[in-house]
Structure formats: structure tokens, C-alpha cells
Interface confidence: medium
């Protein structure tokens, strides 16, 4: 038997993936555990093996189908269970009635690219990945720019309160190396959270022209 507090958190990427993290105080030793998904009105169920991510937490991804297939809707409820092997049988360690569109976390934006760069400004675009058509334009973004000598945590957040897959960064320093990241969040869902940050995009502003005032 396992004692201690347990936390079971899952997010839906809005298409065909539910990612789960299960943490348990009084960690299990060499025990096989899995997450089992049982939808309320779908003809499939799915299982994934929980793999350790730290001493007391495990994670797995329930792959529900092809990456861009719409496997769940706003009215679905999925019973999610953590099952751990105890001898010859499985024991239910945690359970939740999961409402996918109340617990959204999209994939990180992809395909970041510099559209145009000048001495003091840079126009950057990106794409969202595996986002449901249900959102239409109901998405928001946060972006941050890493300046030399600073950390990501120190970078101010720029908020885009609409589905705008580009940004024009202003007041940059000429001939300077920067990095840029963006993340996305649907407006829908009580427990919805930001996507992971995108892979950083490195770019360099153009040097100031000789003899010009900077």
C-alpha cells in the first residue's frame, strides 16, 4: 500500500493528446504504473505507461490518435485513472473526471522566423501547432525577448490579447544578438494554462549605418 498525498494533473492539447503528471509522497519503489483514459461517449480507451520525471513524480502522454485529429469535444468527459501494479492485480491510485476543454494546454508555437529585421526593430512570425478549430480566433499569446546580460526570467512579458501570429519588436539595440520566445493559451477553460515556451529564435539586429545617429 502507498501512503502520502497524491496529485494527479492532466492537460489536453485540444486535438489528440492528454499529458498527465502524477506525484506521490512516499514514493513507489520499482512499481509499474499507468494512466488509463475511459471516455464517456467514445468507442476507444487509451493507456500510457507512467515514467519517472523526478523522485516522486511520473509523467506520460495519452496519444489518442493522429496529431491533428479532433478526438474530443467540449462535451466530453474522460475518466482518468492512475493504476499501479500490486502483485497480480492493478490498484487505482488516483482518479479524476477530466473535462478536456476545461483543462487545456496547447503545444508550444512552432516555425518561428524573422520576417524582417532592422537596426532597432524586428518583425517575427510563428505558427500554432495542433490547435483545435473550435477556438476560432479565441487565443492569446505571450512573448519575451532575451537581451544580452539578462535571463529569461528577467525578460518583460509582451501580451497579445488576440490570435496574432506575429509581433514587431521595437526599441532594440543595433548589432545585438537577441533571442525570442512565444507561448499560447486558449481563452476557454477553467483550468487552462499556458503552453510551454517555444524553442528560442535567435536573431541579430542590423548594425547602425556609419555616420548615422543611433
Amino acid at each position: 500500500a502507498v501512503n502520502g498525498t497524491s496529485q494527479f494533473t492532466c492537460f489536453y492539447n485540444s486535438r489528440a493528446n492528454i499529458s498527465c503528471v502524477w506525484s506521490q509522497d512516499g514514493a513507489l519503489q520499482d512499481t509499474s504504473c499507468q494512466v488509463h483514459a475511459w471516455p464517456d461517449r467514445r468507442r476507444w480507451n487509451q493507456t500510457c505507461e507512467l515514467l519517472p520525471v523526478s523522485q516522486a513524480s511520473w509523467a506520460c502522454n495519452l496519444i489518442l490518435g493522429a496529431p491533428d485529429s479532433q478526438k474530443l469535444t467540449t462535451v466530453d468527459i474522460v475518466t482518468l485513472r492512475v493504476l499501479c501494479r500490486e502483485g497480480v492485480r492493478w490498484r487505482v491510485m488516483a482518479i479524476q473526471d477530466f473535462k478536456p476543454f476545461e483543462n487545456l494546454r496547447l503545444m508550444a508555437p512552432i516555425s518561428l522566423q524573422v520576417v524582417h529585421v532592422e537596426t532597432h526593430r524586428c518583425n517575427i512570425s510563428w505558427e500554432i501547432s495542433q490547435a483545435s478549430h473550435y477556438f476560432e480566433r479565441h487565443l492569446e499569446f505571450e512573448a519575451r525577448t532575451l537581451s544580452p546580460g539578462h535571463t529569461w526570467e528577467e525578460a518583460p512579458l509582451l501580451t497579445l490579447k488576440q490570435k496574432q501570429e506575429w509581433i514587431c519588436l521595437e526599441t532594440l539595440t543595433p548589432d545585438t544578438q537577441y533571442e525570442f520566445q512565444v507561448r499560447v493559451k486558449p481563452l476557454q477553460g477553467e483550468f487552462t494554462t499556458w503552453s510551454p515556451w517555444s524553442q528560442p529564435l535567435a536573431f541579430r539586429t542590423k548594425p547602425a549605418a556609419l555616420g548615422k545617429d543611433t
Epitope: W38, P39, D40, R41, R42, R43, N45, V75, I77, T79, L80, V92, I95, Q96, D97, K99
Partner: antibody, heavy 119, light 106 residues
Framework: EVQLLESGGGLVQPGGSLRLSCAAS????????VHWIRQAPGKGLEWLGA???????QYNAAVKGRFTISRDNSKNTLYLQMNSLRAEDTAVYYC?????????????WGQGTLVTVSS | DIQMTQSPSSLSASVGDRVTITCQAS?????MYWYQQRPGKAPRLLIY???NLASGVPSRFSGSGSGTSYTFTISSLQPEDIATYYC?????????FGQGTKVEIK
Amino acid sequence: EVQLLESGGGLVQPGGSLRLSCAASGFSVTSYGVHWIRQAPGKGLEWLGAIWSGGSTQYNAAVKGRFTISRDNSKNTLYLQMNSLRAEDTAVYYCARAGDANYDGFAYWGQGTLVTVSS
Amino acid sequence: DIQMTQSPSSLSASVGDRVTITCQASSSVSFMYWYQQRPGKAPRLLIYDTSNLASGVPSRFSGSGSGTSYTFTISSLQPEDIATYYCQQWSTYPLTFGQGTKVEIK
């Protein structure tokens, strides 16, 4: 063998309250969703709501706010608390469970309990 | 809410007749269920997932359809089939039933 047994029905005055019970046997209420469905005399079936295996509930908007579904895991029993009852709530109330998968439909039903709302 | 309209509301047929009941949904549904309810009894599941026969149900019962239009058939009516039949959708909440079709023997 899966069995559902409703109880708690009877005569109640308009504006009154009543709590129906649904005793489950042959399965654990923490493993399956259980639904409440009613049927007014001479009428069709109306879905009222459900309590899922994890304990969350879902209601028909027609009764949300007046009716509450709950359960006692230790007794393996479901409840339907009905408040502010009206004459139109007079019906036979059933609890029902789907088959091994929810989409198997309501494979298991109780025998029903009659609620009469009248002064 | 999705409205389910059954037709006919009642019918009378002879033993051995083929009986067909239709259920029209107000918007497209993914799958349909059919129940039999004898007087004074709880409903009994006959067909799930549009066309699958529930456990212990005779093969004279069948179902078909898609989208908004579904059909339930009794290939050869038997005296014990006297009952009211209901369709039900489980595509969106609230779950809804048809108003019922009462089947009688001539």
C-alpha cells in the same frame, strides 16, 4: 450480478423536498457513472443527470439548481436530492448504469420509485 | 438540446409483420440507442451504438441509420413485443429520448 434498487419515493407537497436512494450491487460506484432518469405518468423518459466515477456531476438544465446527485462510496449508494418540488416533478424515478463502456447505453436499470407531488 | 422525434407515435400490426420505427434528431448525432418498455416495467436496452444488439436480445430486433435519421426494425412481430419503444442519443448533453412509439397487436 449488477443490480440497482431505488427507494425513498412517496407523496410530498409542492415546495417540499425528498431524497431518493439508489443502492448498487455487483459493481462499485467509483468505477462507473450512474444516471438518474424519470418518467412522468403516461409520458416519455427524461434524463436528469449523472455522477461520474470520479465523483463529478452533470445535470440537465431543466433541474439544475433544484436537484443534486451525490453518493456514499462506503454504502455503494447514489442519492438524488430534490428540492422545491413541483407538481410536474411527479414521476417514476430510475437510476441506471451503462454497460462496460459508457457508450453501451443504459444496460442496467433499477425498478423505479414513484414520487407524487401534490397538496 | 437535441430533440428526438419518433414516428409513428403508435402502431398496430399483426403477429409476424415487419415493424419499422424511425427517429429523427434535430441535429446530427453519432450513435443511437433503442429501448423497450413494457407496462409497469423499467426500460430494457435493445440496441446500442446504432446497430449492435444488447446481450440476450432476439435477432428479430435491428437498428440502422446515421446523421439525423435512424431506424429500428422488428423483422417479425411477436406477442411479447407489445411495448413502448424509445430512441435515445448519447452524442451531447443533456441526453435525450424520443417521445416513444407504442406497439400493439392487431
